[in-house]
Interface confidence: medium
């Protein structure tokens, strides 16, 4: 590694990043007929153009606009599932409940899910050694700005009843500093969104508390109510049952006893 290369606190670009993005794009457009028109090479060029040769602490939402334009996608605005700190269950749920969508079920979310990337100022190289950490280095890094941009657009598109899955095992069930708390909540459009419904996912098998009464949930309710959006909350006491019982409620384990 050349000695002059900037060392950041976060992990470097995911190995085989260009190939991964291109392969994911091809796979997604094959599976989703409504996105068949997308030219994946152009998508990669737009993605690359957002961060290559730019200082990785000086990325803006404007840098991602060409990519946003190419990845424009219409999902049913009343079938949006947001999540915070519980991505795996949210994704399992939309696999079972095929007509609901997380951000990662859209093309742009699917392309970037679990990947890291950054470049270097004034060189066309991708930095595979390290990338800026949001806390330790800077918030305007390529990954953070990407997720802020797509999350804002996703929330802005939502309508009617919007659902959010929250992790009831965490000390802050609702965290104002999460992407959901800092971006999505503030970009739901009150003229389109009637209700935000939180699904609080319990961790412990014997946990029968009403986590909808948690102070952080009350804080979320307050924020949402001030934005003239109704708030609803439900406990999901057994996430394993939840997935299986939404589709097959007559299963013997789907009675209400915890």
């Amino acid at each position: 590694v050349p000695r002059w290369r900037q060392q950041w606190s976060g992990p470097g670009t995911t190995k085989r990043f260009p190939e991964t993005v291109l392969a994911r794009c091809v796979k997604y457009t094959e599976i989703h007929p409504e996105m068949r028109h997308v030219d994946c090479q152009s998508v990669w060029d737009a993605f690359k153009g957002a961060f290559i040769s730019k200082h990785p602490c000086n990325i803006t939402e404007e840098d991602y606009q060409p990519l946003m334009k190419l990845g424009t996608q219409t999902v049913p605005c009343n079938k949006i599932l947001l999540w915070s700190r519980i991505k795996d269950l949210a994704h399992q749920f939309t696999q079972v409940q095929r007509d609901m969508f997380t951000l990662e079920d859209t093309l742009l979310g699917y392309l970037a899910d679990d990947l890291t990337w950054c470049g270097e100022f004034n060189t066309s190289k991708i930095n595979y050694q390290s990338c800026p950490d949001w806390r330790k280095d800077c918030s305007n890094n390529p990954v953070s700005v990407f997720w802020k941009t797509v999350s804002r657009r996703f929330a802005e598109a939502a309508c009617d009843v919007v659902h959010v899955m929250l992790n009831g095992s965490r000390s802050k069930i609702f965290d104002k500093n999460s992407t959901f708390g800092s971006v999505e909540v503030h970009n739901l459009q009150p003229e389109k969104v009637q209700t935000l419904e939180a699904w609080v996912i319990h961790g412990g098998r014997e946990d029968s508390r009403d986590l909808c009464q948690d102070p952080t949930i009350k804080e979320l309710e307050s924020i949402i109510s001030k934005r003239n959006i109704q708030f609803s909350c439900k406990n999901i006491y057994r996430p394993d049952k939840f997935l299986q019982c939404v589709k097959n409620p007559e299963d013997s384990s789907c009675t209400s006893e915890i």
Epitope: D99, E197, S232, F242, C245, V246, P249, T255, S256, E257
Partner: antibody
Framework: QVQLVQSGAEVKKPGSSVKVSCKAS????????IGWVRQAPGQGLEWMGR????????HYAQKFQGRVTITADESTSTAYMELSSLRSEDTAVYYC????????????????WGQGTLVTVSS | EIVMTQSPATLSVSPGERATLSCRAS??????LAWYQQKPGQAPRLLIY???TRATGIPARFSGSGSGTEFTLTISSLQSEDFAVYYC?????????FGQGTKVEIK
């Protein structure tokens, strides 16, 4: 005011189908179920099935499986119950009701009821 | 399916008296039991859910108790508007099932 308003009475011939609608207004709770319950003249109540409109998830009582179809149009807040291959024993008042409970996917009781739709099956 | 049996079929009570209605499940339904009131030509109305919780707007003279297989609906002092048919419903096991009803009539 929270209410469910159902379509009007129907007279049908044996073997035909009937489709009853149930329009919701003022429902504040997002993920609720709309259940369908029928009551034959002078008889008790019988649960037929339900839909969770927000999830488009349906579930039917085994007795009616294959004959009943429950759908929902979220844009108009309307649920529908279609019963096919009608016979005289299907003459009943059909109610829609909102199901609420502590669990999203499973248990609920019916807290708000439509006014009922009388379906008469007669040749 | 769970069979819900209500007794008595008919209960004759004078206004101001206490009425006690019984509902028995063929197997345990925990506390997942509701009571409804139905007057002629009207839709049922929720009175009690969770075996003992009064629904919104239901007068305090209505109370529910029990869990498992034995449940009771008590109307402490019958008013003229309380004469109706009462149904219990279990929502613990599919399919949801109702009792056959108890008719409370004026003595």
């Amino acid at each position: 005011q929270v209410q469910l308003v159902q379509s009007g009475a129907e007279v049908k011939k044996p073997g035909s189908s009937v489709k009853v609608s149930c329009k919701a207004s003022g429902l504040p709770d997002a993920t609720y179920a709309i259940g369908w319950v029928r009551q034959a003249p002078g008889q008790g109540l019988e649960w037929m099935g339900r839909i969770i409109p927000a999830l488009a998830a349906t579930h039917y009582a085994q007795k009616f499986q294959g004959r009943v179809t429950i759908t929902a149009d979220e844009s108009t807040s309307t649920a529908y119950m279609e019963l096919s291959s009608l016979r005289s024993e299907d003459t009943a008042v059909y109610y829609c009701a909102r199901g609420l409970g502590y669990y999203l996917y499973s248990s609920y009781y019916f807290d708000i009821w439509g006014q009922g739709t009388l379906v008469t099956v007669s040749s | 399916e769970i069979v819900m049996t209500q007794s008595p079929a008919t209960l004759s009570v004078s206004p101001g008296e206490r009425a006690t209605l019984s509902c028995r499940a063929s197997q345990s339904v925990s506390s997942n039991l509701a009571w409804y009131q139905q007057k002629p030509g009207q839709a049922p109305r929720l009175l009690i859910y969770g075996a003992s919780t009064r629904a919104t707007g239901i007068p305090a003279r209505f109370s529910g108790s029990g869990s498992g297989t034995e449940f009771t609906l008590t109307i402490s002092s019958l008013q003229s508007e309380d004469f109706a048919v009462y149904y219990c419903q279990q929502y613990n096991n599919w399919p949801w099932t109702f009792g056959q009803g108890t008719k409370v009539e004026i003595k």
